[in-house]
């Protein structure tokens, strides 16, 4: 056959569903890969054709549309399993064709089996709520073009294995769960299940995402450099190793990128001349609040070493702070020599 | 036993200020419980006030009761508070202190209410 | 805010009855709404919460239907202990305005015919 743009297997959007559940999956050709819309593309007089590979097989092959109960269909761009099979799972491609013109894009699927507490190898979505904030809501995820607007689902959340009825601080309202209080112990997997009938069957969608309770950005401050500080010297005599550590504690905040570096007389360690080297390490607490310390080192400090300004410094979107390590050489101890002089003296 | 008791209801006149309690048994504030304020005026409906969840201090009030009344918690001593100032004769009602009733859960409880009148 | 409005006010019944009061919610309050009960001079009583589940304790011949705007209280057959006001209980959130809405009803008395 003539030349076809073949995009390969976009491996980005690997497509996970539960089994025997319904799955629309919109071609990934019109998202991501050409500049024109499904709509431009029909009218234009292009086809899309749809066909797979089985897991674990090499050949690719027609989907079979002449399923009993059109199991499944093609609408527009949008390839339908109502529902879906375990062995749904391969490689799927959609091409985009007529006599002159062609593209092709293909990407994985894999029909997913869940058990009676919803817990699977889905990849979970991670939503992240602030601690004691107000009211915040998650909204059932990935469940739109499924019904009709005229049709009413039933939504039923849970935490885990729980049906969410007995929480008093959270209030499921529909596609939406309110959360009056976040707390640490909201931190968990929701799971929402829509039931809705089509065609005389009734359908359920399962959704399942992790929610993580951070912390709040009206106790968001700047950056606090808990070392250096005022009540350590770092005292050494040349030929020491002089270890001084930048210990900063950054608020959680949102898309913040928190940055800790050290200069040495103003300068950053890689444009200056001395043997110098930075470890650093990074903890986080239960609302995602971070430490982050860098250990810097010099093996074998040296008297100019020992005069030199060592400043740690700290950012994140809250603001900027800076804190001088105090290094000074240590003085030798006094030597005392005890002189004996023992005069016989004449008389 | 698990049990709520409201106390300092009064005869109070209109202007003036009363401070409510509501002693807590059986379970504690550190748990997390919205505690409610609830009032009934003399033969008419029930009215929810105000709420506080026992564990973080987190208030609610409803939109008529902003202002002049004030929830708060003694967590130390299990008991909860509402600081009514400004009373009008239509605060006159048995006010009962409930569990857990801004969500309802099963763990709903109440006190038996206390009597405030507000007349000259 | 959210407006509870329930009908009838008040109903007469007898022993053996089988009563049913209705709670009409302003907006969608979804299931999130609780029945009570109330005799005079006590505190009231939770019968039913998320609009059908029995709270512990309660005598099945009570059961709660409905979501969205239109609940119902059903008492199977009404026993002589049943005589008191019945008070439905909306809740919602408001994201816009970081606000927990709520509401009574005003109230069905139920009274021996």
């Known amino acids: 056959s003539e030349r076809c743009d073949d995009w390969g297997l976009d491996t980005m959007r690997q497509i996970q569903v539960f089994e025997d559940e319904p799955a629309r999956i919109k071609c990934p050709l019109f998202e991501h890969f050409l500049k024109f819309n499904y709509s431009t593309a029909h009218s234009a007089g292009l086809t899309l054709i749809w066909y797979w590979t089985r897991q674990d097989r090499d050949l690719e092959e027609p989907i079979n549309f002449r399923l009993p109960e059109n199991r499944i269909s093609k609408e527009k761009d949008v390839l339908w399993f109502r529902p879906t099979l375990l062995n749904d799972t391969g490689n799927y491609t959609c091409m985009l064709r007529n006599t002159t013109y062609c593209s092709k894009v293909a990407f994985p699927l894999e029909v997913v089996q869940k058990d009676s507490c919803f817990n699977s190898p889905m990849k979970l979505p991670v939503h992240k709520l602030y601690i004691e904030y107000g009211i915040q809501r998650i909204t059932c995820p990935n469940v739109d073009g499924y019904f009709p607007s005229s049709v009413k689902p039933t939504i039923t959340w849970y935490m885990g294995c729980y049906k969410i009825q007995n929480f008093n601080n959270v209030i499921p309202e529909g596609m939406n769960l309110s959360f009056l209080i976040a707390l640490i112990s909201n931190n968990g997997n929701y799971t929402c299940v829509v039931t809705y009938p089509e065609n005389g069957r009734t359908f359920h969608l399962t959704r399942t995402l992790t929610v993580k309770v951070v912390g709040s950005p009206k106790n968001a401050v700047p950056p606090v450099i808990h070392s250096p500080n005022d009540h350590v010297v770092y005292e050494k005599e040349p030929g020491e190793e002089l270890l001084i550590p930048c210990t900063v504690y950054f608020s959680f905040l949102m898309d913040s990128r928190n940055e800790v570096w050290w200069t040495i007389d103003g300068k950053k360690p890689d444009d200056i001349t001395i043997d110098v080297t930075i470890n650093e390490s990074i903890s986080h607490s239960r609302t995602e609040d971070e430490t982050r310390t860098q250990i810097l080192s010099i093996k074998k400090v040296t008297s100019e070493d020992l005069k030199r300004s060592y400043v740690c410094h700290a950012r994140s979107a809250k603001g900027e702070v800076a804190k001088a390590a105090k290094v000074k050489q240590k003085v030798p101890a006094p030597r005392y020599t005890v002189e004996l002089a023992c005069g016989f003296g004449a008389t | 036993e698990v049990q709520l008791e409201e106390s300092g209801g009064d005869l109070v006149q209109p202007g003036g200020s009363l401070r409510l309690s509501c002693a807590a048994s059986?379970?504690?504030?550190?748990?997390?419980?919205?505690i409610c304020w609830v009032r009934q005026a003399p033969g008419k409906g029930l009215e929810l006030v105000s709420c506080?969840?026992?564990?973080?201090?987190?208030?609610w009030y409803a939109s008529w009761a902003k202002g002049r009344f004030t929830i708060s918690r003694d967590n130390s001593k299990n008991t909860l508070y509402l600081q009514m100032n400004s009373l009008r004769a239509e605060d006159t009602a048995v006010y009962f202190c409930?569990?857990?009733?801004?969500?309802?859960?099963?763990?709903?409880?109440w006190g038996q209410g206390t009597l405030v009148t507000v007349s000259s | 805010d959210i407006v509870m409005t329930q009908s009838p006010s008040s109903l007469s019944a007898s022993v053996g009855d089988r009563v049913t009061i209705t709670c009409q919610a302003s907006?969608?309050?979804?299931?999130?709404l609780a029945w009570f009960q109330q005799k005079p001079g006590q505190a009231p009583k939770l019968l039913i919460y998320?609009?059908?589940t029995l709270a512990s304790g309660v005598p099945s011949r009570f059961s709660g239907s409905g979501s969205g705007t239109e609940f119902t209280l059903t008492i199977s057959s009404l026993q002589p202990e049943d005589f008191a006001t019945y008070y439905c209980?909306?809740?919602?959130?408001?994201?816009?305005?970081?606000?927990?809405?709520?509401?009574f009803g005003q109230g069905t008395k139920v009274v021996i015919k």
């Open positions: 409930a569990r857990d009733l801004l969500v309802v859960t099963s763990f709903n409880l």
């Open positions: 059986g379970f504690s504030f550190s748990s997390n419980y919205w």
């Open positions: 209980l909306g809740v919602c959130t408001d994201i816009s305005t970081d606000d927990l809405y709520n509401a």
């Open positions: 907006e969608d309050i979804y299931s999130n």
């Open positions: 998320g609009a059908s």
């Open positions: 506080i969840y026992t564990s973080t201090g987190n208030t």
